[in-house]
């Protein structure tokens, strides 16, 4: 969490941002809140990106002002206009690109004063893994697949019964480049699995950590997946 205060001139206002990560090809949110003002027409929101010649987004007098928007953000940004009055300056970024990563500044002017706060925005690809029994294999085998990751993640297998065991000798992981030549499909195979055990396939890079669990018994198979972003720090 980054909390910024205003500088010079009028009183300072508190602006708060939260570091976040964007999944390339999907829409992302750059979070920013501020002390609200009673008049929408008195609020100016500017989003800037370090090292960029134009603005990321500007909202003033109750509407978008995009005359000085940088070309790399053209047609891809929006604020939540109906929530600005209550202090939400968050920015929606459409079709996140790898090059959107960097340091952003949320700069606010209201009748109470000015304030700004920076946020770090990471970009990459992350997806939920799915673990299945590979019935085509000669021995009992599990196959963990996740369609989109970038940068290349690490894959670690774990088991509930053999806690602390190292499965690197009995697993094989491959990374297959997807058609857009950036993200990769992750496939990891675990051999010699035993029945009545829960296995976890953990995929992690510097942006996200995802886990796919599978419990195999003689009567049923239970699956569970979850994904966690690693860098959500508020400022």
């Amino acid at each position: 969490l980054i909390i910024g205060f205003g500088i010079s001139g009028r009183h300072s206002i508190t602006v708060t941002t939260v570091a976040s990560a964007g999944n390339i090809g999907e829409d992302g949110i750059l979070s920013c809140t501020f002390e609200p003002d009673i008049k929408l027409s008195d609020i100016v929101i500017q989003w800037l990106k370090e090292g960029v010649l134009g603005l990321v987004h500007e909202f003033k007098e109750g509407k978008d002002e995009l005359s000085e928007q940088d070309e790399m953000f053209r047609g891809r940004t929006a604020v939540f206009a109906d929530q600005v009055i209550v202090g939400n300056a968050s920015l929606r970024l459409k079709n996140v690109q790898l090059t959107d990563a960097g340091t952003y500044k949320c700069y606010i002017i209201t009748s109470k004063g000015k304030g700004n706060a920076n946020l770090e925005y990471k970009t990459g690809a992350f997806s939920m893994p799915e673990v299945n029994v590979d019935y085509n294999a000669s021995s009992e085998t599990l196959r963990c697949e996740a369609p989109r990751w970038f940068p290349q993640p690490t894959v670690v297998w774990a088991s509930q019964v053999d806690q602390g065991a190292n499965f690197s000798e009995v697993s094989n992981t491959s990374f297959e480049l997807n058609s857009e030549n950036v993200t990769m499909k992750v496939v990891s195979v675990l051999y010699n699995v035993t029945i009545n055990n829960t296995y976890s396939c953990m995929i992690e890079n510097d942006i996200a950590k995802a886990t796919g669990d599978i419990k195999v018994t003689e009567s049923e198979i239970k699956r569970r997946s979850h994904l966690q972003l690693l860098n959500s720090k508020a400022s």
Partner: antibody, heavy 122, light 107 residues
């Protein structure tokens, strides 16, 4: 201490190509946009091209659009200018300069290289 | 692209003189204007940015003013080391444009 050092200039025939480099040191290179500026012999300054800190945006003067390509390698702290289809009027000293860090807030063109001479002649 | 027109293109002045150079933009560039000084055979040097902000290390005899389309560089008391060519430069759009330059010579 901030330093910018251009290289790659020289004599080239019309229609030829040349690649200029600018090695940067003394500052966080990826935090700044960078520009190329040229100066023909006895003439004024002409902005040529700029690139954002992360390399996601590139900008060109109309006179070089479609012929020149600006790029950067932040891992090497180096800025490049690939110049193709060179013409006699491209003859100039080419400078790299540190451009803006934050829109509307920071100085720009506060540091310059010493320049590298490009001569286009048959 | 925004065009920048400087005047005069050259001027002769004496040490101690007050010198004023003007720069006009073809359309508004807000306050996104810089002034640079160049001496023969040297790279340009930034003097003023954001129309009126003095770059660190630049003597206080240099000052800038204006906004929108009309800008002025003033040297309050010309010194021997100030004889050089001065350029205005806009950065209010993605392109950066320089004026054609003003050469300040010794009278």
């Amino acid at each position: 201490e901030v330093q910018l050092l251009e290289s790659g200039g020289g004599l080239v025939q019309p229609g030829g190509s040349l690649r200029l480099s600018c090695a940067a040191s003394g500052f966080t290179f990826s935090s700044y946009a960078m520009s190329w500026v040229r100066q023909a012999p006895g003439k004024g300054l002409e902005w040529v091209s700029a690139i954002s800190g992360g390399g996601g945006s590139t900008y060109y003067a109309d006179s070089v659009k479609g012929r020149f390509t600006i790029s950067r390698d932040n891992s090497k702290n180096t800025l490049y200018l690939q110049m193709n289809s060179l013409r006699a009027e491209d003859t100039a000293v080419y400078y790299c300069a540190r451009d803006i860090q934050w829109y509307g807030e920071s100085t720009l063109f506060d540091y310059w290289g010493q320049g590298t001479l490009v001569t286009v002649s048959s | 692209d925004i065009q920048m027109t400087q005047s005069p293109s050259s001027l002769s002045a004496s040490v101690g003189d007050r010198v004023t150079i003007t720069c006009r933009a073809s359309q508004s560039t807000r306050s996104w204007l810089a002034w640079l000084q160049q001496k023969p055979g040297k790279a340009p040097k930034l003097l003023i940015y954001k129309a009126s902000s003095l770059e660190s290390g630049v003597p206080s005899r240099f000052s800038g003013s204006g906004s929108g389309t009309d800008f002025t560089l003033t040297i309050s008391s010309l010194q021997p080391e100030d004889f050089a060519t001065y350029y205005c430069q806009q950065y209010g759009s993605y392109s950066r444009t320089f004026g054609q330059g003003t050469k300040v010579e010794i009278k």
